[in-house]
Every structure is written in C-alpha cells, then in structure tokens.
C-alpha cells in the first residue's frame, strides 16, 4: 500500500483466486483515543472500533471511504484504491491499446518542435467516475521538471472498431528545454488514471526528437508557368517550426492528387520551398513537411486545388506568413566552402544513417549488463557546447571540436568489432559508406597534420553475436541524433557564417593551434 | 434493519435446474457482495461462490464451476443462484448471505431454501 | 483449497462451564478467520470476525484468538441459548473454506 496523495491510498493486489487479499491498517488521525468508531463509504455501519482498523483488501468492495467518527464527528478519511496485478501484469483496463506498433501504446505524444513543449493524449471508453493526472520529467534519476497542463477532454471523438471512444490530451512543457542539444536522457510522461476505485498509471518514454511532426505547410499557393502544363508551388515553413529555419530545417515532399482523392505514386521530395509540378483541372495538390535530418513523423499534408485559385491547408497547419528564412538558397553568397562542404557531408550521414538502421516506431531496445559503457559514454553535442545559432555565431570553434570527438568517436565504433565482427556486414552496404563518410567529415574538420586529442575511446565489444546486433542498432540509433545535430550546425554555418566573420572552417584550421589545446583541457564536459 | 429474505422450497427432477433467489432490504444492496452456502441434510456448510451486485463480478468455488450461475438483478435488489443439471447429491438447504466489506466473511445470512432432488 | 479441521467434532458440556473450540488451517490465513453459530433449522449467526473481533449485538462471552493456522473459539461461562454447532471459516484465499462443525451439547 502506499499514498497516492493526501488521505488516498493505493492497494495493490494480485488478482488470481489463490491470492490472499492484502491486509491494511487504516489509522484514525486525531489526539482523540476513546469512543471511535469506523464506518465506509458501502456502509453507515459500524465497522470497528477503536484508533485503527484491519480490513481486508480482496475485491472492489473493500475499497473505498473509510470514515473514522467520535459522537457524530467525522475525525479523519483514508480512500482506498485497488490496483491490480493479474499473473504479474498490472491491469491496464481504463485505457484503449493504440495499435500501431509491436509495444503496447496507450499514451501518444507528439511535439510540432524542439522547445521541449509537447502534446499527449490517449483514448477510453469510459465516461463517468474517471480522474486523470500527469507528472512528467527528463530522466527519473535526478529528474529534470517538465511541467504539464491540465488534462482535457477533447471535442474529438475517435472510432475504432465501431466502438466510440473520449480522447483526453495533455499539454507539457519542459522547464529548461535546449533545442540545439542532442538527447541523451528521455521523457518519462507518467499518466495515473482513477475509475471509481480502480487505479492504473500508464507511461511513456521519448526524446523529443522522436515524437518530432510539424504542422503542415503553409501558404500553399500555386503559379501557372507560361507555355506549360506545368504549375510553380510554393509554401512556407508552418508558424509552429523551430526557428531559425537554416538551422532547423525541413524537407517537403509534393504529390499529385487526381480525382476522388486517388493518389498518384510519384512523390517529389525538395529541400526548398517551392517546386514545379503537373497540375490537371481536376487534381489537387498537396505537400506535407518533415525534419530534414531526422526521421520522424511527416505532417499532415496541406493541399491546394488546381482548378481554384489561391491556397489551402490541411490538418492542424495554421496560417499566417511566417517561413521567415525558409527560402534560403541552396549554396548562400560568400560562405566558406569548408561549411558548404560540411553541409553536404554531413546531410549524406543523416541518408546513410537512417538507411543503416531505419525508423521502427518508437522501440525501447532492451539494457544489457556492459552495454552503457560503450553507449552511455557517447561524447553528446550539449547545451553548453555552442552548437546552437547563437553559440556558432559566438564562436563555433567550441561546437565544431565536440563534433570532431563525436565523429572520431564513432569513426572508430564502426570499424571495430562490433561491426567487424558476426553477423557480418556488406564492406559497400550502408554501414560501410557511413564509416567512409564519417571520415570524410573528420578529415574536413581536422586535416592531415592536426591531430586533436579525444577524451573518449570505445569499449570492448560483447561477444555474442546477438549482444552485438543490439549494440549495432543502439550505436546507429545514438549516430542518428547526433549527425542530425551536426547537419543542422554545417547547414547553418553554410547558411550564415562569412569568411569574414571570422567564424569560417577555413579561419578555425589557421587559429593557433595551442589555443585548441587549452580549450581542450579547460573546457571539459560531463556526459550523462 | 438488514434481511435477505429468500424464494420457498422447491422440489425438481434430476437433470433439471434451479433458480433460487435472495431479496436484499434495510442496507444499500449495491455496494455489498452477496454469497451462496449450501448445506446438505445433517452436513456442515459448502461455500459456492460470491458476487458483487454493482459490476457482476463472480467468484466461484471450483467444484461449483460450471453447474453454479449467479446473477442479480439491481433494480429489484435481488440475487439469483441457479444450479443446473441437479442429481441426488444436490439435495440441500441454499442460504444467500451478504459479504462484509473490508472483510470476507458474512455478516447477514437468509433464511435458507430447500432443494429437494426427486424422480 | 484450504482445509480447516475442527476439533473436537461434539462435545458435551454444563451450563456455567468454560467451553474452548479449536480450528486449524492447512496453510496459514493470517487473521482471517470467523466463527459462526448455527442452531437446528436456523441460519448461521456471525460471532466473531478476524480471528477475535466481537460481531456487533454478540455477548462478550464469546472470544476469539489465534493467527497462522491456529484458532480457538472460546465460550467463558456456557448459557442455556449457547447449545448449537460452531463452524470457523476462512476467508483469505478463495474459495473461503468452512470447517466440519462442532457440535456443542447439554451434559
């Protein structure tokens, strides 16, 4: 038993016919000592006498209020809730399962950006006796505050299986939030749900980066080309992306809709914010957005008609102009070429990366005695590393060596033999072109004849083949987010950073190089 | 004052069922769990089973399983045990009795109704 | 199941005399043990619940102890109305097992 809030406790039982119930001694709180009598929410009844009571917990009817009484006076309650365990699984019936992965789900999160405020809901069939609260951290050791809303029930009625069920949502917000920072702890969101007497809690863990999808594009807006069958669409950046936009950037992906909403297959996918296309009468046009350097979800589409004039939009997208540097070109006036060609560098990894080891849906891979070692000590780009906008323009010198550690760092775990070894991997397949890219990118960042000291070296790899296949999937999955880190950083300083700034690669590799020895050894960090 | 006052004796042939039935009064019948106890002639008490009257929720002894149906009806404040294919052995006094809460044993008993089994 | 043994099955005793009913468990039920009185062509009456708590409107006689597996039911001082069966039952695993009863006579 244990203390949900003030005067509301929790019993947990294991509901099988061969389990005892659970003995519980409530206590009546007050100075008082004779005449107390005890009665329960079941019952005017008395049900005992004296400071405690022992009941037995064994079914729902043993729950509930009980009141502790001296002449007519209520002195004190205790409520008690049942949470049950049936062969070891603690029930999860006040929520319905969404089915859309191998895990079971009833809490879906999702974020339109990285300033760590983010949206949950879940679904029930129940309407009447049902409480709700949220409590949210990053990380349950030394949790970090996120702080979430109140829970709302939604207009929104969702179908499934010819079953109506509520949708309730919550909205969280994470108190320091560091968009620019690579995650290395996660979201914990814990959901406790009351009905009548039953007590549930539901949870999900997340980075944010994971539960990533943008509102769709705005402004979709079509021009006719003259002499041609073809259109010019254009769209802007949603208002609710993170800005800036040459930092954290998207890609879009247009598709022709014919008559009655049919599809048509062929999906053009840009970078920029405008493409040519075929637009019959009759079809519609739609475009929908993702991060540019990090798999998760699509937006909803926005769509404009090709017979009408002017724009539309789908979804959730909100208007407005917005966008503002969107439209940046591909390879800006005066940018050093060391940036452009980290840029491209750099969006190669996050292809190769994400080809090596494809979204799954949010997997949790299960911990390995010994694996932290290897994963855990992972040198993350971090809120103080200066690889955010304003950190770069300061001085990137900081935020380009924690990338040079990271790309020695995992230089070195893709050819060692975790990834040598069994089961093995094709020397041209994905892995093999992301070992020989991330080279190409170390190289960029430290020519022949600069060698920069790193703190970290990888582990030993485990010895069975299978420890190694999940130590693969855990190495590509933390390659991920720290090469969508990086690619943000190069397209930004391609986007931004002159060679007059001072700020250029080209500039930082004729800096003094005892200057980056002392920032090496006065500007450590700490890793989680 | 709390009483569960039970349906009369009923005689039946073998093979056929029973349905006795057990009317709560002076106690808010919903929130307590209702039990059968069978007693065959000059024998001690057998417990078959509880209900709760709110959600249906039944637990029965594994001897009764599958012979013993409990049922309530909340709007006339009344439990039923129906026992199928009744022989010999079923020939008994069935008393309905109410679950104490925070407890599980029972506090308020019927009067008892007769089964008698007979060709 | 629970098996719960009463002993003894029958005992004749006076009225005035200190009568002592003993039930054990087959395995241990914690507190959770009551006793129940049954006279001929009655329904059983609750005496004590929890192995030793006094059922509302029962003489203070009537007291019950023990925990585990071991319980006694005891009668301080027999009076004429006492003479029936006594039945322990526990009710701490289902199914919620009765003892085999003990009959109580006039000496």
């Known amino acids: 038993i244990w203390e949900l809030e003030k005067d509301v406790y929790v019993v947990e039982l294991d509901w099988h016919p061969d389990a005892p119930g659970e003995m519980v001694v409530l206590t009546c709180h007050t100075p008082e000592e004779d005449d107390i009598t005890w009665t329960s929410a079941q019952s005017s009844e008395v049900l005992g006498s004296g400071k405690t009571l022992t009941i037995q917990v064994k079914e729902f009817g043993d729950a509930g209020q009980y009141t502790c009484h001296k002449g007519g006076k209520v002195l004190s309650r205790s409520l008690l809730l049942i949470h049950k365990k049936e062969d070891g699984i603690w029930s999860t019936d006040i929520l319905k399962e969404q089915k859309e992965s191998k895990n079971k789900i009833f809490l879906k999160c999702e974020a339109k950006n990285y300033s760590g405020r983010f949206t949950c809901w879940w679904l029930t069939a129940i309407s009447t006796d049902l409480k709700f609260s949220v409590k949210s951290s990053r990380g349950f050791s030394d949790p970090q505050g996120v702080t979430c809303g109140a829970v709302t029930l939604s207009a929104e009625r969702v179908r499934v299986d010819n079953r109506d069920y509520k949708k309730y949502t919550v909205e969280c917000q994470e108190g320091s939030a560091c968009p620019s920072a690579e995650e290395s702890l996660p979201i914990e969101v814990v959901v406790d749900a009351i009905h009548k007497l039953k007590y549930e809690n539901y949870t999900s863990s997340f980075f944010i980066r994971d539960i990533i999808k943008p509102d769709p594009p705005t402004n979709l807006q079509l021009k006719p080309l003259k002499n041609s069958r073809h259109v010019e669409v254009s769209w802007e950046y949603p208002d609710t992306w993170s800005t800036p936009h040459s930092y954290f950037s998207l890609t879009f992906c247009i598709q022709a809709q014919g008559k009655n909403n049919r599809e048509k297959k062929d999906r053009l996918c840009v970078d920029k914010t405008s493409a040519k296309v075929v637009c019959h009468k009759d079809a519609k046009i739609r475009v929908q957005a993702r991060d540019r350097y990090y798999s998760s979800s699509w937006s909803d589409w926005a769509s404009v008609s090709c017979s009408g004039s002017g724009s539309s939009r789908g979804g959730s997208g909100s208007g407005g102009s917005g966008g503002g540097g969107s439209k940046l070109r591909a390879v800006p006036e005066g940018s050093s070429p060391a940036w452009i060609q980290g840029q491209q560098l750099s969006q190669k990894l996050c292809t190769l990366v994400w080809s090596a080891h494809p979204p799954m849906g949010h997997v949790d891979l299960p911990r390995e005695e010994g694996d932290g070692e290897t994963t855990s000590d992972v040198p993350r780009i971090q809120c103080g590393d200066g690889c955010d906008p304003q950190g770069l323009k300061d001085n990137s010198q900081f935020c380009l060596q924690r990338i040079h550690q990271g790309l020695v760092f995992y230089e070195k775990l893709l050819g060692s033999d975790i990834f040598t070894g069994e089961p093995s991997l094709l020397p041209d397949g994905p892995v093999g072109q992301l070992h020989a890219n991330l080279l190409g990118l170390r190289q960029l960042l430290q020519p022949e004849g600069h060698h920069w000291e790193t703190e970290q070296t990888p582990s030993p790899s485990p010895s069975q083949p299978w420890q190694r296949l999940l130590l693969r999937l855990k190495i590509l999955r933390s390659l991920q987010a720290f090469v969508a880190v990086a690619a943000r950083v190069f397209a930004h300083g391609a986007a931004t950073l002159s060679p007059g700034s001072g700020s250029g690669l080209n500039d930082i590799f004729e800096a003094q190089k005892i200057e980056w020895h002392e920032h090496h050894h006065h500007h450590h960090h700490h890793h989680h | 004052e709390v009483q569960l006052v039970q349906s009369g004796a009923e005689v039946k042939k073998p093979g056929a069922s029973v349905k006795v039935s057990c009317k709560g009064s002076g106690y808010s019948f919903t929130t307590y769990w209702l039990g059968w106890v069978r007693q065959a002639p000059g024998a001690g008490l057998d417990w078959m089973g509880i209900?709760?009257?709110?959600?249906?929720?039944?637990r029965y002894a594994g001897k009764f399983q599958g012979q013993v149906t409990m049922s309530v009806d909340t709007s006339t404040s009344t439990a039923y045990m129906e026992l199928s294919s009744l022989r010999a052995g079923d020939i008994a006094v069935y008393y309905c009795a109410r679950r104490r809460p925070g407890q599980g044993y029972f506090d308020f008993w019927g009067q008892g109704t007769l089964v008698t089994v007979s060709s | 199941d629970i098996q719960m043994t009463q002993s003894p099955s029958s005992l004749s005793a006076s009225v005035g005399d200190r009568v002592t009913i003993t039930c054990r468990a087959s395995?241990?039920?914690?507190?959770?043990l009551a006793w129940y009185q049954q006279k001929p062509e009655k329904a059983p009456k609750s005496l004590i619940y929890?192995?030793?708590s006094l059922q509302s409107g029962v003489p203070s006689r009537f007291s019950g102890s023990g925990s585990g597996t071991d319980f006694t039911l005891t009668i301080s001082s027999l009076q004429p109305e006492d003479f029936a069966t006594y039945y322990c039952?526990?009710?701490?695993?289902?199914?919620?097992?009765f003892g085999q009863g003990t009959k109580l006579e006039i000496k």
């Open positions: 209900m709760s009257p709110v959600d249906s929720d039944i």
């Open positions: 039952q526990q009710y701490n695993i289902y199914p919620y097992t």
């Open positions: 395995q241990g039920i914690s507190s959770w």
């Open positions: 929890a192995a030793s």
